[in-house]
């Protein structure tokens, strides 16, 4: 899909399993043509997405794409949930697909769940 509109490249129904206590960077890949748009992150609470105001964010610039990063330093158990990034572009609000973080509480390294185990957890809501 090639255009000069802003594009937010988060895949639909993307998921990440992460460990509480670890650092984690959640990336929102942003494509734009001229001026970099204003991008924000929000966390879904039911059907409402609550803007994350006081969280550390940063930009990473690459050749063809930029990344707006939400930092988790460290990941906390209540970071579990779904997140969305949004861009303001020419008075339009462009929203990404949501991406879901599944946070596992701190365990010893040998007890870390595999991605397959995480994917089978009954508490994953769909």
């Amino acid at each position: 899909k090639e255009s000069c509109d802003v594009q937010l490249y988060i895949k639909r129904q993307s998921e990440h399993s992460i460990l509480a206590g670890d650092p984690f960077e959640l990336e929102c890949p942003v494509k734009y043509c001229a001026n970099r748009p204003h991008v924000t992150w929000c966390k879904l609470n039911g059907t409402t997405c609550v803007k994350l105001e006081d969280r550390q964010t940063s930009w990473k610039e690459e050749k063809n794409i930029s990344f707006f990063i939400l930092h988790f330093e460290p990941v906390l158990p209540n970071d579990n949930g779904s997140y969305r990034c949004s861009a303001n572009f020419q008075s339009n609000l462009i929203e990404s697909h949501s991406t879901t973080l599944y946070v596992t509480d701190v365990k010893s390294a040998s007890e870390r769940p595999s991605k397959d185990e995480m994917a089978s957890r009954p508490w994953l809501l769909y």
Partner: antibody
Framework: QVQLVQSGAEVKKPGASVKVSCKAS????????MYWVRQAPGQGLEWIGR????????RYAQKFQGRATITADTSTSTVYMELSSLRSEDTAVYYC????????????WGQGTLVTVSS | EIVLTQSPGTLSVSPGERATISCRSS???????????LNWLQQKPGQAPRRLIY???KRDTGVPDRFSGSGSGTDFTLTISRVEPEDFAVYYC?????????FGQGTKLEIK
């Protein structure tokens, strides 16, 4: 254009495992989801599971949880599906497929791999 | 899991006639993003399936415009306005809204 090429037919004994490969071309698989579907002789389609090659995150149908393992090697654009503890009912054509993770703008299937489980 | 029920199981038509296949879902396929992830596949004997329709009504590249999809919520239809000889095949609906992904049982379109 996006293409998928699967490994060749396999004959396995009950209790054994099989690992089928699926190599993609014409796309960066990190921008996709890749999934596996099987079709027993004369039957319909059955979804096994999918992988996000960007981070390795997998989803499985409950029926295959613990018995199927889907993995991805982004360096070779190849996805694998391993099925363990094979039984005769697992005899089927196994298809891999790939779709665009952002807009679902394409959905392409491999040619299929026949796995025969027989003693 | 979502159950998709197709009807009829077999549809006999003559070339040039209209063919209509129904797919009913056990729950709504409307996703939280406002889109409905209902697809239609065509499978010919000895071949891999091929996607014809996605997001209920969008035709894949190269799919003739005699194929159309419609519906919303739980009820969906694939219509072939004038069946051509190459259209005789098995058609499947499948949903991409919830996990696990599920397929209808298939509808065989055969020559009358």
């Amino acid at each position: 254009q996006v293409q998928l090429v699967q490994s060749g037919a396999e004959v396995k004994k009950p209790g054994a495992s099989v690992k089928v490969s699926c190599k993609a071309s014409g796309v960066n698989i990190k921008d996709t989801y890749m999934y596996w579907v099987r079709q027993a002789p004369g039957q319909g389609l059955e979804w096994i599971g999918r992988i996000d090659p960007a981070n390795g995150y997998t989803r499985y149908a409950q029926k295959f949880q613990g018995r199927a393992t889907i993995t991805a090697d982004t360096s070779t654009s190849t996805v694998y599906m391993e099925l363990s503890s094979l039984r005769s009912e697992d005899t089927a054509v196994y298809y891999c497929a790939v779709y665009d993770g952002y807009y679902e703008s394409f959905d392409v299937w491999g040619q299929g791999t026949l796995v025969t489980v027989s003693s | 899991e979502i159950v998709l029920t197709q009807s009829p199981g077999t549809l006999s038509v003559s070339p040039g006639e209209r063919a209509t296949i129904s797919c009913r879902s056990s729950q709504s396929l409307l996703d939280s993003d406002g889109k409905t992830y209902l697809n239609w596949l065509q499978q010919k004997p000895g071949q891999a399936p091929r996607r014809l329709i996605y997001l209920v009504s969008k035709r894949d590249t190269g799919v003739p415009d005699r194929f159309s999809g419609s519906g919303s919520g739980t009820d969906f239809t694939l219509t072939i306005s004038r069946v051509e000889p190459e259209d005789f095949a098995v058609y499947y609906c499948w949903q991409g809204t919830l996990f696990p992904r599920t397929f209808g049982q298939g509808t065989k379109l055969e020559i009358k």
